[in-house]
Interface confidence: low
């Protein structure tokens, strides 16, 4: 019946609106309802205009699909013509009253089936059921796998490919490690895989600026070093450098009124020349302070060197040697005065003798037949040298003496001329000023070393060489080399160093052979007012340690390689250094900073006297040590 109605409507439409022209009311009579009429009539007018001898070309475009007016008008009521549905997504189109219904294929949705359903985003079937990649396609979807995986037969799940088993030579000399979806060519730490050569190559960490100051690369790693000689040490991160810090402040106050006699390791500290009337006689008065037992206080001579007078210290007592055309004499006497106290000393030439007084009390009188120095042309010309000789005079001396003297003088009056401009000279030269307070001991300022040549070979000992070291230390900085043996090839076969500990306010003692730490005594409180006593005994078979907290013997089994290196070095030439290292490579030892603080050293039963060193940095004090700084210090 419905189709019958449709046919009737079609006939009426042809008659009313194609064979004739119809207005909207006439069209209403055809359709008998408003929605269809309202839909039809505007489109009908477009068809009319379109086929009115092609005048309205703009409107015509939308009717180009129809060959004539009849087909154009007849198509208007059919909502499915032209097809409103998306051709890819629709299955069928159903015409309705001024409406249509598109039925969609699976995987499509929307009024016109224009929207693809994204199965990958379906909340009821997460990721479309794919285990890895879900690829949505128009009207469908499919699963795929990431690189390094293969799809299983269910077309949804993926399985890892084991590339290492698949191609055993994948990584060359490196180790192949399978990982999900991929593989890695693994190299030991410090090596980097080279794709071209399929091998592990050493990483030059030094070229990657890993270290703050100095860097040494080696296969599989690198070591950072800091310039200890400039006061740096390696920080805990083992890369950056930090300044070696003071752990025990010292009172380094000096006074220019006090003349320091050991400013030079070898040489005169002050030279004066006097030209006085011929009636003048030699005289010298001064206060003197030292802990040193031997050395030259002053040496006076005539212009032509023919007559001379030596005032020195030997065994802690004043010694006078003199020589002129009449006589040559040597006398030692008085109390021991190397007690660290100020002692007033005077040496005065009288008419027939030379009088030596300590604290204004005569301790020696030396007879002399004539004047000590002979005047010439009505003038007495005399040269006076403090703390040394002007040239090699050993052969002229009545009894040889080591001239080096660590001491101070003050309140001097030479040739009865008072201080006569000397203070002004000294005032400008800081290194000629003496410390206000000192204690017994040797002081290493952290800027130099002392060198000794010691024979460690003991012919009577079956062990061959042996090193027995006793150190009494009071460090001022927590890092530095205390003692080192250096071979002629610039290696350091044995060193005893101090290193700031990882634990707060304590130090470690490190014993090293070349650049290897063979023993570390950890967390000792060495930066204190009290001196610490350390003993080491080393021979080719073992190392014995004695510290305030530990007594231990480490046998050869544990140290075999290192003791063998040391044994080989000890059979050759080694120099002994105190307070630091000479110019050896930074990588030669684990520590290269200078030691700063007080230290007395006994090696194989002999107390080392820094005045006897082969060489010594001028700033090292052989027989005086600054006091510990006190907050309420009196200068």
């Amino acid at each position: 019946a419905n189709s019958m109605l449709e046919e009737t409507k079609q006939g009426n439409l042809e008659r009313e609106c194609i064979e004739e022209l119809c207005n909207k009311e006439e069209a209403r009579e055809v359709f008998e309802n408003d929605p269809e009429t309202d839909y039809f009539y505007p489109k009908y007018l477009v068809c009319l205009r379109s086929f009115q001898s092609g005048l309205f070309t703009a409107a015509r475009q939308s009717t180009d699909a129809y060959p004539d007016l009849r087909s154009c008008v007849n198509a208007i009521p059919d909502q499915c013509s032209p097809l409103p549905c998306n051709e890819d997504g629709y299955m069928s189109c159903k015409d309705g009253k001024a409406s249509f219904t598109c039925t969609c294929k699976p995987g499509w949705q929307g009024e016109k089936c224009e929207f693809d359903i994204n199965e990958c985003k379906d909340p009821s079937n997460i990721n479309g059921g794919c285990s890895q990649i879900c690829d949505n396609t128009p009207g469908s979807y499919h699963c795929s796998c990431k690189s390094g995986f293969v799809m299983l037969s269910n077309k949804k799940d993926c399985k890892d490919v084991d590339e290492c088993s698949l191609k055993p030579n994948m990584c060359g000399t490196a180790v192949c490690k399978n990982i999900p979806g991929d593989f890695e060519c693994e190299c030991p730490e410090g090596y980097r895989y080279n794709l071209k050569s399929k091998s592990c190559e050493d990483v030059d960490e030094c070229s990657e600026n890993m270290c703050a100051q100095l860097c040494v690369n080696y296969p599989g790693g690198y070591t950072c070093y800091c310039d200890g000689k400039k006061g740096f040490k390696l920080a805990q991160d083992q890369k950056s450098c930090e300044a070696v810090s003071v752990c025990l402040p010292l009172n380094l106050d000096t006074k220019y009124e006090l003349l320091y006699l050991a400013e030079q390791f070898a040489g005169v500290v002050l030279y004066l020349k006097f030209r006085l009337p011929e009636i003048s006689r030699f005289s010298a008065e001064f206060d003197f302070r030292t802990y040193d037992s031997q050395g030259v206080i002053l040496y006076a001579e005539s212009i032509d060197h023919s007559a001379w007078l030596l005032i020195a210290l030997r065994g802690g007592k004043i010694e006078v040697q003199l020589k002129n055309e009449h006589t040559s004499k040597i006398t030692t006497g008085g109390d021991i005065i190397n007690n660290g106290l100020w002692n007033m000393v005077s040496v005065e030439e009288l008419e027939h003798s030379i009088s030596i007084k300590i604290a204004k009390e005569a301790v020696m009188d030396i007879n002399k037949p004539g004047p000590l120095f002979k005047p010439e042309n009505g003038l007495l010309e005399t040269k006076v040298y403090f703390a040394g000789f002007p040239r090699k005079v050993e052969s002229e001396l009545i009894k040889p003496i080591n001239p080096r003297l660590d001491g101070c003088i003050r309140s001097w009056n030479l040739m009865k001329q008072g201080a006569s401009g000397i203070k002004e000279i000294i005032q400008e030269k800081q290194n000629k000023h003496c410390l206000v307070t000192v204690e017994k001991g040797s002081y290493y300022p952290g800027s130099g070393i002392a060198e000794f040549h010691i024979d460690y070979n003991n012919g009577s000992n079956a062990e061959g060489w042996h090193i027995n070291v006793t150190l009494n230390i009071r460090p001022s900085m927590g890092t530095g080399v205390m003692l080192a043996l250096v071979s002629s090839n610039n290696t350091v076969p044995f060193a005893v160093s101090l290193v700031d500990s990882t634990s707060e306010k304590s130090q470690d003692i490190v014993i090293s052979v070349e650049n290897t730490v063979i023993y570390r005594i950890q967390a000792l409180s060495l930066c204190s007012n009290q001196r610490s006593h350390l003993e080491f005994r080393v021979n080719r078979n073992n190392l014995e340690l004695l510290t305030p907290l530990k007594i231990e013997t480490i046998s050869q089994e544990e140290l075999q390689t290192q003791l063998a290196i040391l044994d080989k070095a000890m059979k050759g030439k080694v120099a002994t250094y105190l307070g630091g290292l000479p110019d050896v490579p930074f990588s030669a030892t684990p520590v290269n900073a200078f030691y700063n603080g007080c230290m007395e050293v006994n090696i194989n039963g002999v107390e080392l006297d820094l005045d006897e060193a082969i060489s010594k940095h001028n700033d090292i004090r052989a027989h005086s040590c600054p006091s510990v700084w006190k907050k309420t210090k009196n200068s």
Epitope: D204, E208, A212
Partner: antibody, heavy 120, light 110 residues
């Protein structure tokens, strides 16, 4: 003689990304011993180190810029690049690329510099 | 504000010597020997003049010398010449593994 040449837009809008490239000629960017650096100079003449990269990809950045800066290397074109995100007017400067010696923090070759203005 | 402090300007007559100071802290200038100086003629590329406190790259005149005392580094130019007129920047490595520059000193040759 090594030469460096900066290139990139001279004007960038605030909040956008500043991108510059440095082309190296007369030497290979993959040579051992050099880091490739970016430095900028503010209008008031102060220099500010931005960061540098080693050809292996290791980067070192100024901590004050770390969250905004990326330096990358293109070894095939012998170039390295700077990206600075979320720029403000304070990022207006002459940007220099330079070669840094690995043996010390010294810049031995510099580009001529390129002025980048951040303005809307 | 630059991390290292330099005078804004210095001047000298031809033939004279001048010194430019660069003050930092113990964490940069005072803590390392990695101090350098750059000469910058406006519109040109900066040029490395001194490195490692006092070393000169090849090609740099020996009229330029560097030194350091405590936390302060100095650049001295002797026998001043007209072509020395430029901006001079000091630079130092820092404890936090970064590089800092001075604010720059303008040298005027009178």
């Amino acid at each position: 003689q090594v030469q460096l040449q900066e290139s990139g837009p001279g004007l960038v809008k605030p909040s956008q990304t500043l991108s510059l490239t440095c082309t190296v000629s007369g030497g290979s960017i993959t040579s051992d011993g050099y880091h490739w650096s970016w430095i900028r100079q503010y209008p008031g003449k102060g220099l500010d180190w931005i960061g540098y990269i080693y050809y292996t990809g290791n980067t070192y950045y100024n901590p004050s810029l770390k969250s905004r800066v990326t330096i990358s290397v293109g070894t095939s074109q012998n170039q390295f690049s700077l990206k600075l995100i979320s720029v403000t007017a304070a990022d207006t400067a002459v940007y220099y690329c330079a070669r840094r010696l690995s043996t010390g923090p010294y810049f031995d070759y510099w580009g001529q510099g390129t002025l980048v203005t951040v303005s809307s | 504000q630059s991390a290292l402090t330099q005078p804004a300007s210095v001047s000298g007559s031809p033939g004279q010597s001048i010194t430019i100071s660069c003050t930092g802290t113990s964490s940069d200038v005072g803590g390392y020997e990695f101090v350098s100086w750059y000469q910058h003629h406006p519109g040109k590329a900066p040029k490395l003049m001194i490195y490692d406190v006092s070393s000169r790259p090849s090609g740099v005149s020996n009229r330029f010398s560097g030194s350091k005392s405590g936390n302060t580094a100095s650049l001295t130019i002797s026998g001043l010449q007209a072509e020395d007129e430029a901006d001079y920047y000091c630079s130092s490595y820092t404890r936090s593994s970064t590089v800092v520059f001075g604010g720059g000193a303008r040298l005027t040759v009178l």
